[in-house]
C-alpha cells in the first residue's frame, strides 16, 4: 500500500463570463478556489479504482473535475466518458505534483454521468471515478419566513423552512414610508438569523437561496402614528405563528402597555415586553403579543392599549387556506395611440401572491404595492400601444387566480389587398372596428366612385391575432369585371384608408396597385 | 487543504443554549455530497456522535438528544452551526466537527477530517 | 441502537509487537465501519475505513478485517508514535456509535 500514490482530486467553480461551450484544460475564467472532494479508494474494488465524492452542478454551471498526483516520473492518462475516450494533457505544477484537469462548460444534462480518468504512472496504474450530476431543483423550495422567540432571551428568531438551507437576513428601517425602499440608504441589513434590536420602525425578515427571495413584515402598531382611515388586518392561515408588535414613545418611563383579545387580556406567555432610551432620551416601549401556533378562535381585534397614548387595533383573522380575493370579470379598454395608459389589478391575498403578466405569449415581471386598506394592487403599463389579449395570472400556492383584459388602440385602417383568379380581398385592423365599401373604376368614374352593390362579402373579426380583431371582405369575381380597376375602402371615426386592385383575366400573378387615399 | 474549525463559547451556564460554529475550508457543503458531523468526548470518555448535515440539507439526529439539537448550515459562510438547548454539567465535553464524504457508488467515506475540537464547561 | 464493544479496553505492549484490536457489534453492520487512532489533547485521525481500507498516507502496519458483527484493527510491529487510544465506529445505521476505546500503553 505505500507505493500508492498520494492522490488529491479536486472541484474548481467557474463564474462563468462566457457563452462558448466545450471541455478543455486551460479556459480563461473567473475561478473559485478549489474545493477537496475527499478522493479515497473504493473498498473492495477490483484493481486501485479511487473515487470522489459525487458532484452536484447547477444547470449552466462550469466546473473543473482537477487530478494531483504526487507520484516519480512521467504520467499519462485518458478520460473516458459515456464510452468515448477524451484528450487528456497533464502537466506538472510547482510542487512538482501531476495534474490533470477536465472542464465541463455550461452544464447540460447530457454532461451528467461518470468521468472516469485512467493515469499511468512508471510504478503503477490506477482509476479515478468522478461522478457529475445536475443538482435536482424540482426538490427545492422556498417558503416564507417566520418568527419565532429565541428561550430565554429578549430576540426575535427568523426561520425559513426551506431546500436549499436559504441564506436569511433582516432588513431594518428607522423612516416612514417610501424611504424604507430596499436599495435606500435608510435600510440596513444583517445577515443572521437571531435579531435583539427590536425597536426600529419597520422590521422584515427575508429568506434568499436558489428559487429566489420571500419576506415577512413584523406586523406593528405604532401608537405614536396617527391610526389608518380603516383598520389594519392581517391574515394568518391555522398553525402558523402570529406576532404583533405594539411600540409607543413617551417623554418618560411613566406609562405602560397591554394587549387585549375582544377586550380580554392575553394571557400570561402570550406577551412579552421591552423597553429602551432613544437617543433624545425618550423612552421606547416594545409589546409583542403572539401565538405560536394559531388556531381559529384566535381570530378577533387586538387591542394595544398605553396609559399615555390612545390605544389601536388591528383584525386578525384566521383562515383554514389561503385566498386570493378579486373580480376576475374582464375589462376591455380602448385608448388612443399615445395615450398613457396601465392596467391594474386590485386584490386582496393571504399569502402573498406571486405574479406574471403575458401578452403575445410572453411574460412581464410582475410588480405589487400594498395600499392602505389592506389590499393590494399590480399595475403593468409597459403594453407599447399594442392592441390585444393581456392576462394576469396569481397564485399563492392555496389559490390561482387570472384576469382577462383587452386592449384596443382607437386609430385609423390599414388595408391590405390581395387578388386570385375568382375574387379579390381586403382586410384592415384598424379600431373601431372598420366598414367596407368597393368601388369601379371606369371611364365613366375615373375617380373610382362608381358603387359595386352584388358579390361583396364582409366578415368582421373573422381571425384573433393575440386578441386582436381583423376585418375582412371579399368580392367575388363576375366575368364582366375582369380586367377593370377596383377599390376597397376601409372606414372608421377616425378615417378611411383604400387599396386599388386590378382584376386581371385569369393568371397566376394578379396585379395589386398601392393606392391609399 | 481541508480543515475545520470549531468555535463559541468556552463557558455556559446551567439551562442556557449553546451554539456552535464549525467554520470549513477547502472543501465546501454546496457543490459535492458531503456533510459535516457534530461529535462530542467528555473528559476522559468515549466519543458520542451527535448531528450531520449534509449539502442537500438531510440532517440526522442522536436519538437520545434530538429534542435538544438543531443544525443548520450556512453556505455563503462555509458554516455549520449546531445548537443544543437546556445545557447541563453533564454536558462538559471537547465538541468536534469532522467531515463525511458521500461517493458516486453510493458508500460514505466518515470522518476523514476533524476539527481540533473546543471544549465546552456547563458550570453555574 | 447498535452497539459497539471494543476490547480490551487497555493494553500493555512493547515496540515491535504485534498487537490486535477488537470490536463487536450488536448486529451485523456489512463492512461500514472505520478505525481511528487519538492522542491526548487531540482530535482523532482515520486510519481504516470500510473496515479494510486504509486511508491514504497512513502506515501500512495497520491493516483492517472483517464484517457483519467481528472487527479487529491490528499493529504488525508496533512504533513509539503507535501508543494512543483507539476506537472503532459503525455508521451502518443511525445513531452512528462509537466503540469506548482501547488505549494502547508502553509496557
Known amino acids: 500500500n505505500q507505493d500508492l500514490p498520494v492522490i488529491k482530486c479536486v472541484l474548481i467553480n467557474h463564474k462563468n463570463n462566457d457563452s462558448s461551450v466545450g471541455k478543455s484544460s486551460s479556459y480563461p475564467m473567473v475561478s473559485e478556489s478549489p474545493e477537496d472532494l475527499g478522493c479515497a479508494l473504493r473498498p473492495q474494488s477490483a484493481g486501485t479504482v479511487y473515487e470522489a465524492a459525487t458532484v452536484e452542478v447547477d444547470v449552466s454551471a462550469s466546473i473543473t473535475l482537477q487530478v494531483l498526483v504526487d507520484t516519480p516520473g512521467n504520467i499519462s492518462c485518458l478520460w473516458v466518458f459515456k464510452h468515448s475516450s477524451l484528450n487528456c494533457q497533464p502537466h506538472f505544477d510547482v510542487q512538482n505534483r501531476g495534474v490533470v484537469s477536465m472542464v465541463i462548460l455550461k452544464m447540460t444534462e447530457t454532461q451528467a454521468g461518470e468521468y472516469l480518468l485512467f493515469i499511468q504512472s512508471e510504478a503503477t496504474n490506477y482509476t479515478i471515478l468522478f461522478t457529475v450530476s445536475i443538482r435536482n431543483t424540482l426538490l427545492f423550495t422556498l417558503r416564507r419566513p417566520y418568527f419565532r422567540k429565541m428561550e430565554n432571551q429578549d430576540a426575535l428568531v427568523c426561520i425559513s423552512e426551506s431546500v436549499p438551507e436559504p441564506i436569511v437576513e433582516w432588513v431594518l428601517c428607522d423612516s416612514q414610508g417610501e424611504s424604507c425602499k430596499e436599495e435606500s440608504p435608510a435600510v440596513v441589513k444583517k445577515e443572521e438569523k437571531v435579531l435583539h434590536e427590536l425597536f426600529g420602525t419597520d422590521i422584515r425578515c427575508c429568506a434568499r437561496n436558489e428559487l429566489g427571495r420571500e419576506c415577512t413584515r413584523l406586523f406593528t402598531i405604532d401608537l405614536n402614528q396617527t391610526p389608518q382611515t380603516t383598520l389594519p388586518q392581517l391574515f394568518l392561515k391555522v398553525g402558523e405563528p402570529l406576532w404583533i408588535r405594539c411600540k409607543a414613545v413617551h417623554v418618560n418611563h411613566g406609562f405602560g402597555l397591554t394587549w387585549e383579545l375582544e377586550n380580554k387580556a392575553l394571557e400570561e406567555g402570550s406577551y412579552f415586553e421591552m423597553s429602551t432610551y432613544s437617543t433624545n432620551r425618550t423612552m421606547i416601549r416594545i409589546l409583542f403579543a403572539f401565538v405560536s401556533s394559531v388556531a381559529r378562535n384566535d381570530t378577533g381585534y387586538y387591542t394595544c392599549s398605553s396609559s399615555k397614548h390612545p390605544s389601536q387595533s388591528a383584525l386578525v383573522t384566521i383562515v383554514e387556506k389561503g385566498f386570493i380575493n378579486a373580480t376576475n370579470s374582464s375589462e376591455d379598454y380602448e385608448i388612443d395611440q399615445y395615450e398613457e395608459f396601465c392596467f391594474s389589478v386590485r386584490f386582496k391575498a393571504y399569502p402573498q401572491i406571486r405574479c406574471t403578466w403575458t401578452f403575445s405569449r410572453k411574460s412581464f415581471p410582475c410588480e405589487q404595492k400594498g395600499l392602505d386598506d389592506g389590499y393590494s394592487v399590480s399595475k403593468f403599463c409597459n403594453h407599447k400601444h399594442q392592441p390585444g389579449e393581456y392576462i394576469f395570472h396569481a397564485e399563492n400556492g392555496d389559490a390561482q387566480f387570472t384576469k382577462m383584459f383587452t386592449l384596443n388602440i382607437r386609430r385609423k385602417p390599414q388595408v391590405l389587398a390581395e387578388a386570385s383568379a375568382s375574387q379579390a380581398s381586403c382586410s384592415s385592423d384598424g379600431y373601431p372596428l372598420p366598414s367596407w365599401t368597393w368601388k369601379k373604376c371606369s371611364d365613366k368614374s375615373p375617380n373610382c366612385t362608381e358603387d359595386i352593390p352584388e358579390g361583396v362579402w364582409n366578415r368582421k373579426a373573422n381571425r384573433k391575432v393575440f386578441g386582436q380583431w381583423v376585418s375582412s371582405s371579399t368580392l367575388n369575381m363576375s366575368e364582366a369585371m375582369k380586367g377593370f380597376l377596383v377599390k376597397c375602402c376601409a372606414y372608421n371615426s377616425l378615417g378611411t384608408s383604400c387599396e386599388t386592385i386590378l382584376l386581371n383575366s385569369p393568371g397566376p400573378f394578379p396585379f395589386i396597385q398601392d393606392s391609399i387615399s | 487543504q481541508v480543515t475545520l474549525k470549531e468555535s463559541g463559547p468556552a463557558l455556559v451556564k446551567p439551562t442556557e443554549t449553546l451554539t456552535l460554529t464549525c467554520t470549513l475550508s477547502g472543501f465546501s457543503l454546496n457543490n459535492a455530497r458531503m456533510a459535516v458531523s457534530w461529535i462530542r468526548q467528555p473528559p476522559g470518555k468515549c466519543l458520542e456522535w451527535l448531528a450531520h448535515?449534509?449539502?442537500?440539507?438531510?440532517?440526522s439526529y442522536s436519538t437520545s438528544l434530538k429534542s435538544r439539537l438543531t443544525i443548520s448550515k450556512d453556505t455563503s459562510k462555509s458554516q455549520v452551526v449546531l445548537t443544543m438547548t437546556n445545557m447541563d454539567p453533564e454536558d462538559t465535553a471537547t465538541y468536534y466537527c469532522?467531515?463525511?464524504?458521500?461517493?458516486?457508488?453510493?458508500?460514505?467515506?466518515?470522518?476523514?477530517?476533524w476539527g481540533q475540537g473546543i471544549l465546552v464547561t456547563v458550570s453555574s | 441502537d447498535i452497539q459497539m464493544t471494543q476490547s480490551p479496553s487497555s493494553l500493555s505492549a512493547s515496540v515491535g509487537d504485534r498487537v490486535t484490536i477488537t470490536c463487536r457489534a450488536s448486529?451485523?453492520?456489512?463492512?461500514?465501519l472505520a478505525w481511528y487512532q487519538q492522542k491526548p489533547g487531540k482530535a482523532p485521525k482515520r486510519l481504516i475505513y470500510a473496515a479494510s481500507s486504509l486511508q491514504s498516507g497512513v502506515p501500512s502496519r495497520f491493516s483492517g478485517s472483517g464484517s457483519g458483527t467481528e472487527f479487529t484493527l491490528t499493529i504488525s510491529s508496533l512504533q513509539p508514535e503507535d501508543f494512543a487510544t483507539y476506537y472503532c465506529?459503525?455508521?451502518?445505521?443511525?445513531?452512528?456509535?462509537f466503540g469506548c476505546g482501547t488505549k494502547v500503553e508502553i509496557k
Open positions: 469532522a467531515r463525511i464524504v458521500g461517493y458516486g457508488t453510493g458508500w460514505y467515506g466518515f470522518f476523514d477530517y
Open positions: 465506529l459503525q455508521h451502518n445505521s443511525y445513531p452512528l456509535t
Open positions: 448535515i449534509f449539502s442537500n440539507d438531510e440532517k
Open positions: 448486529q451485523g453492520i456489512r463492512n461500514d
